[in-house]
């Protein structure tokens, strides 16, 4: 590696993947194994992230970039850069501190993560339940009871917008 020659800061010429080694007269030295520098002019290299246990390696560490982790199957990532791994549950369950627990009656979860949410209350939109809800699925709302009676108008007013799967508290 070339000896740096900057008049202002001799370290500014050290490229990514190296560090400015004060012990060697500010020569640009390569980052040691299991470390990296992602920008030039660094006086130290950063230790590579280790992906072990609940984490597994998505991208290996290089001299210029940190390792990237994801989660071992059975768990999913949380947080920026997959800073945590959280347990998966089955559909129809939610994660609690006691582990995965079935959704209570009247609630559902159609994913492996997240919380159980209340079934949609069809009657709030003036509709009837077409398909009953389960632990894994929301109810399906059908036409209002009035729409099903003979001679009723086939036009129904639009339902107010509401977040899917949530009933107003």
């Amino acid at each position: 590696f070339e000896r740096t020659r900057s008049l202002q800061d001799p370290c500014s010429n050290c490229p990514a993947g190296t560090f400015c080694d004060n012990n060697r007269n500010q020569i640009c030295s390569p980052c040691p194994p299991n470390s990296f520098s992602s920008a030039g002019g660094q006086r130290t290299c950063d230790i590579c992230r280790q992906c072990k246990g609940v984490f597994r390696t998505r991208k290996e560490c290089s001299s210029t970039s940190n390792a990237e982790c994801d989660c071992t199957p059975g768990f999913h990532c949380l947080g920026a850069g997959c800073s945590m791994c959280e347990q998966d549950c089955k559909q129809g369950q939610e994660l609690t501190k006691k582990g995965c627990k079935d959704c209570c009656f009247g609630t559902f979860n159609d994913q492996k993560r997240g919380i159980c949410r209340p079934w949609t209350n069809c009657s709030l939109d003036g509709k009837s339940v077409l398909v009953n809800g389960t632990k894994e699925r929301d109810v399906v709302c059908g036409p209002s009871p009035a729409d099903l009676s003979p001679g009723a108008s086939s036009v129904t007013p639009p339902a107010p917008a509401r977040e899917p799967g949530h009933s107003p508290q």
């Epitope: 246990g53 609940v54 768990f75 949380l78 947080g79 800073s83 945590m84 791994c85 959280e86 347990q87 994660l95 609690t96 501190k97």
Partner: nanobody, 123 residues
Framework: EVQLVESGGGLVQPGGSLRLSCAAS?????NYWMNWVRQAPGKGLEW???????????YYVDSVKGRFTISRDNAKNSLYLQMSSLRAEDTAVYYC????????????????SGQGTTVTVSS
Amino acid sequence: EVQLVESGGGLVQPGGSLRLSCAASGFTLSNYWMNWVRQAPGKGLEWVANINQDGSERYYVDSVKGRFTISRDNAKNSLYLQMSSLRAEDTAVYYCARGGEGYGVDHYGLDVSGQGTTVTVSS
């Protein structure tokens, strides 16, 4: 550096017992929920048990209830898993893992885990 190191695994006969230990360093154990998780050969990762900061709350996956006991010694910065009445299906790599900041409130994410210790139950 934040680190967890598991030990105590080995080969044991069905019905036997084993005690796993996890030594924590680089952080104050008493500030965190702690967990044991395991990975059986060819299977996904499975949560086994957790314990709150002072040991007053402990929870287990159904398959180990009454057989496994999680405990901690904050003064020794150590976590334990006492396993008894072991079965072939308990064969796995066991990892100790720290509950991240906000565990049990905002999420149940684990942010640090060790390299694991292997438990083999076989006659």
